[in-house]
């Protein structure tokens, strides 16, 4: 008999981790005698239903170092259905684990700290019902370095008063370096904290006053977060308690003794002014978060930044005046003292014009690399000002109202009415794409010297004057504008160094042969989601410009619904990756031979995505006319019911083939051809119920095979032959396997179990009825002990 996975119903992962997450367990599992429990150092039981922990639950895991019991019995307010749950922990439950270093009991209805082993280094008690920490709570935990106890008294996990940390309760924890007590309704910083503390996080409490005695003796502090204690509720994304006073009250000497402080968070504190004495003595301060305050006036004349010569990051975002956008903004001269500043965030301050005077004090800062100015209602911007900044690498002007190149006109008045914040800026970075080589589909601009993000503005046309003096720009994002012009090779003339251009989500008309040819160094061009012009009946589109872009390596024409009246062939010797997903090749390739050679002229193409192209068939001649250089071909989410597998020999270098989300019903029609270099094949989310014997056996390089979410009732060694032992990934989850006793697939899957992800829990039975939806290990199918199952055989 094959050996069952050692830690059923859980899964053994690398580095001594047993993963028991999301298994609906009601008790801590007892592993079989065959399981080598002494090698297990980490056990994760997240999101189960364990409401009672017994003294004996962990005695067999004496070498455990990490235990995660998060989300087993959540407090009422945090439970999805608001069920009440109280977790019972017997007194000696955790004492059996003498080497335990990390324990997470968060999101459980416990009201007291259980007895814990003295070996503990890291303890999480967040989102529980523990409301008191006194000297007895953590007595004897001399090794404890990290304590998280957030969210034990707030709107999602309410309590009648507040969490109470008695004075000196933690003083015995002489090695404690990290303490987090956020969202606990605290009205004061607990007194007599251990002087070893380096990180103290008390944000989103009700601490509206802070003085030196609140932080007395905490001279080792490196990070202090006191944000969100006196909130500006007009910018709150969650229930917000109005601060009972106009701002957080900070004693001038509150931080004077914290000479090691590197990070200070004073966000969402209703601050209207900055007192330069707050920052005196903070010689090592490198990160300062002053976001979500009322510092719109202060930043124009403050001298508080005068001595912050080591500050690297400064966040001033959302320091707007309620219902007002300013005509202009001028930073105070003291910004010029921030000689180490690398990143300045000024989004959401709401000012309408950006010119040379706006940021003048920053122009001399040698280290400044990142400037965030998004969501400011800027409608007039002199982009050339960034030429003067010596080290600038990234400027974000997205989500503004810039509509084109315009000389600034004198604008009078402070405000223009009640513009409010409607959205949070999303992360606009494109998702990484899986490729066999090191060439990602969309190059990451973070490695380039200068990026300008103008996405989500009001641009209708692009004029070269906009980019005067920006010849050093290497990456330009113009996605989500309203650009509807026919680009002809004159729009981007000044940008002679541009390598990446993102024009996705516009309405570009691609007609001119010389489009983008003014960009001699262009390597990546994103023209996805420009579908409107392609939908105009009777209007032709010309892709001949691609051939003229000699350095272009990455091109996206995705999601344009390209279906007819376009160039018959794309040509390029430089192009390596083409995303053509979300178009209508199914329609194009149905037009006789007209578009049969559409991709053939891309002689160096390695990566081609033809997903979502409404393909019902893929004829061998179509594959024959794809570039021979292809290594990755994606055909996801089409309507392919058949595939002529022998035709893969037309693609001699193909390593990855993705056919997920099609309508394949069987893997027949011959087999994968001998000599194929295919390394990864994904046919998940089809309707495959049959695989011909030997189908995969000739593909000697095949290492990763995804057969998940199909209609397979078995998995057979005969499909693979000797190849089976070489597989690194064989995903057969979400198939309706027929779990009869003596099922052949059982021995095979046990033989290759190291390659089968989620084997203990995600590989399930579809039949017989009593086992439907259960793990294939719910009963030992190797032994015919169950009459019903035997009968099924």
């Amino acid at each position: 008999l094959g050996t069952l996975p050692a830690f059923l119903p859980c899964e053994l992962k690398p580095h001594g981790l047993v993963d028991c997450n999301w298994l609906f367990l009601k008790s801590v599992p007892r592993f079989s005698a065959a399981a080598s429990c002494s090698n297990i150092t980490r056990l994760s039981l997240i999101s189960n239903r364990i409401h009672h922990l017994h003294n004996s639950d962990f005695v067999h895991l004496s070498n455990l170092r990490q235990l995660n019991l998060k989300w087993n019995c959540p407090p009422t307010g945090l439970s999805p259905l608001h069920f009440s749950c109280h977790m019972t922990i017997e007194p000696r439950t955790f004492l059996a684990m003498r080497t335990l270093e990390e324990l997470n009991l968060s999101y459980n209805g416990i009201t007291t700290v259980p007895r814990l082993p003295s070996s503990l280094v890291n303890l999480s008690l967040s989102h529980t019902n523990i409301l008191v920490l006194d000297a007895n709570s953590l007595a004897g935990l001399y090794s404890l370095r990290v304590l998280f106890m957030d969210g034990n008294c707030y709107y999602k996990n309410p309590c009648t008063g507040a969490v109470k940390v008695t004075p000196g309760a933690l003083l015995g924890l002489s090695n404690l370096t990290h303490l987090s007590l956020k969202y606990n309704n605290l009205t004061k910083v607990p007194r007599q904290l251990p002087p070893s503390l380096e990180y103290l996080l008390v944000s989103y409490n009700l601490i509206v006053k802070l003085g030196p005695e609140d932080l007395a003796n905490l001279t080792s502090l490196r990070v202090l977060d006191v944000g969100g204690n006196c909130r500006r509720c007009d910018h709150a994304p969650n229930p917000c308690i109005e601060c009972g006073q106009k701002s957080l009250h900070l004693h001038p000497e509150t931080f004077h003794h914290l000479s090691h402080l590197e990070g200070l968070v004073l966000k969402d504190s209703s601050l209207h002014t900055l007192n330069s004495s707050w920052f005196q003595g903070l010689v090592n301060l490198s990160v300062l978060d002053l976001s979500e305050n009322f510092l719109y006036e202060s930043i124009t004349h403050t001298n508080a930044f005068q001595n912050l010569t080591r500050l690297r990051k400064l966040n001033l975002s959302f320091n707007y005046r309620k219902k007002v956008s300013f005509a202009r903004l001028h930073l105070a001269p003291s910004f010029g003292s921030l000689v180490a500043l690398k990143e300045l965030d000024m989004h959401g301050i709401f000012f309408r014009s950006l010119d040379e005077t706006t940021l003048r004090p920053l122009a001399r800062l040698p280290m400044l690399q990142t400037l965030r100015l998004q969501m400011n209602f800027i409608n007039q911007a002199q982009l050339g000002i960034f030429r003067a900044f010596p080290g600038l690498r990234y400027v974000d002007l997205s989500d503004n109202r810039i509509s084109g190149a315009s000389e600034l006109t004198a604008t009078m008045g402070e405000a223009d009415g009640g513009e409010k914040v409607w959205l949070q800026p999303g992360d606009l970075a494109p998702a990484p794409v899986d490729t066999p080589s090191s060439e990602d589909f969309r190059p990451n601009c973070s490695t380039l010297n200068f990026t300008l993000d103008l996405s989500r503005n009001n641009l209708v046309t692009v004029q070269p004057e906009m980019f005067a003096q920006l010849s050093h720009l290497q990456c330009l994002r113009l996605s989500h504008n309203c650009i509807s012009q026919a680009v002809n090779g004159s729009q981007f003339l000044p940008l002679t160094g541009l390598q990446v251009l993102d024009l996705s989500h516009n309405k570009l008309d691609l007609y001119h042969e010389h489009s983008f040819t003014e960009l001699p160094r262009l390597e990546a061009l994103d023209l996805s989601y420009n579908s409107q012009p392609f939908g105009m009946q009777g209007v032709g589109h010309n892709f001949s410009f691609v051939a003229h872009l000699r350095t272009l390596r990455h091109l996206s024409l995705a999601h344009n619904n390209i279906h007819s009246q376009v160039s018959q062939q794309l040509c390029s010797t430089s192009l390596r990756a083409l995303d053509f997903s979300g178009n209508a090749l199914g329609h194009m390739w149905a037009e006789g031979d007209l578009y049969l050679h559409f991709f053939q002229g891309l002689s160096g193409l390695i990566w081609l995505d033809l997903s979502q192209n409404r393909l019902h068939t893929l004829l061998p001649q179509t594959l024959r006319n794809l570039p021979k250089s292809l290594q990755v071909l994606r055909l996801r989410d089409n309507y392919l019911a058949f595939f002529k597998w022998w035709s893969l020999h037309f693609l001699p270098k193909l390593e990855v083939l993705d056919l997920a989300g099609n309508q394949l019903k069987a893997l027949t029609n011959g087999s994968l051809p001998a000599g194929t270099r295919l390394r990864r094949l994904d046919v998940s989310c089809n309707s495959i119920s049959f695989v011909a014997p030997g189908f995969f056996s000739k593909a000697k390089e095949l290492r990763e095979l995804n057969l998940s979410a199909n209609a397979l009732k078995t998995v057979d060694h005969s499909w693979f032959g000797p190849l089976a032992s070489a597989l690194q990934i064989l995903d057969v989850s979400a198939n309706p396997l027929h779990c009869a006793c003596g099922a052949a697939f059982m021995d095979f899957l046990l033989e290759v179990q190291a390659a089968v992800p989620g084997l203990p829990s995600r590989v399930k039975c579809g039949s017989p009825g009593q086992l439907q939806g259960l793990s294939i290990f719910a009963q030992d199918l190797r032994l015919c002990l169950d009459e019903a199952l035997s009968w099924d055989c």
């Epitope: 004075p167 009205t187 006053k209 003085g211 005695e213 006073q245 106009k246 001038p252 209207h272």
Partner: antibody, heavy 116, light 106 residues
Framework: QVHLQQSGPDLVKPGASVQMSCKTS????????LHWVRQRPGQGLEWIGW????????KYNDQFRGRTTLTADKSSSTAYMFLSSLTSEDSAIYFC?????????WGQGTTLTVSS | DIQMTQSPSSLSASLGGKVTITCKAS??????IAWYQHKPGKGPRLLIH???TLQPGIPSRFSGSGSGRDYSLSISNLEPEDIATYYC????????FGGGTKLEIK
């Protein structure tokens, strides 16, 4: 040395209003709380409320809310207490005191007599 | 609101002797208590804060102790200038004074 100088004694009629002052010196007025405390004849001390001159925030003892207004003039570093609808019960010595947490410096007191 | 019960309301002691005044809070005040000496015609004078921290310039004959709800002020080696009324003040949640203790010398 920190100094709090209060205005002189006052005699007012019932129903009238009064404003008393507390002029501070030798510390940064806007950085600390300024409290007012009452002591009726033969009685103990009662906290009335505070003002934080830095931003003008105020907090009052429920017993005094409504008839009492605390203000501060940053330019002269002076705090004021305005009492309205006075009765004989308001006859007392009124102290101002500076604090961050606890009251560390006090004025000498202003005696208010409410009598017809 | 937190109430402070101070006792005794008055006491008489001999010069050179020792007295103890107590304050009981209606709830745990986490050591946020201060003690004041008040003489007629003057403003009160801070003696002790945070239950036991002696204010600079105050003689070491004065000491404070306690935790939770119960706190005390002790004056040893009594001197004539100690004749005054003594008040406790809680500053854990807003501010409340005790009723005062009038100290006389026998």
């Amino acid at each position: 040395q920190v100094h709090l100088q209060q205005s002189g004694p006052d005699l007012v009629k019932p129903g009238a209003s009064v404003q008393m002052s507390c002029k501070t010196s030798d510390y940064t007025f806007t950085n600390y709380y300024l409290h007012w405390v009452r002591q009726r004849p033969g009685q103990g001390l009662e906290w009335i409320g505070w003002i934080y001159p830095g931003d003008g925030s105020t907090k009052y003892n429920d017993q005094f809310r409504g008839r009492t207004t605390l203000t501060a003039d940053k330019s002269s570093s002076t705090a004021y207490m305005f009492l309205s609808s006075l009765t004989s019960e308001d006859s007392a010595i009124y102290f101002c005191a500076k604090s961050w947490d606890y009251f560390d410096y006090w004025g000498q007191g202003t005696t208010l007599t409410v009598s017809s | 609101d937190i109430q402070m019960t101070q006792s005794p309301s008055s006491l008489s002691a001999s010069l050179g002797g020792k007295v103890t005044i107590t304050c009981k809070a209606s709830q745990d005040i986490d050591n946020y208590i201060a003690w004041y000496q008040h003489k007629p015609g003057k403003g009160p004078r801070l003696l002790i804060h945070y239950a036991s921290t002696l204010q600079p310039g105050i003689p070491s004959r004065f000491s404070g102790s306690g935790s939770g709800r119960d706190y005390s002020l002790s004056i040893s080696n009594l001197e004539p200038e100690d004749i005054a009324t003594y008040y406790c003040l809680q500053y854990d949640d807003l501010y409340t004074f005790g009723g005062g203790t009038k100290l006389e010398i026998k």
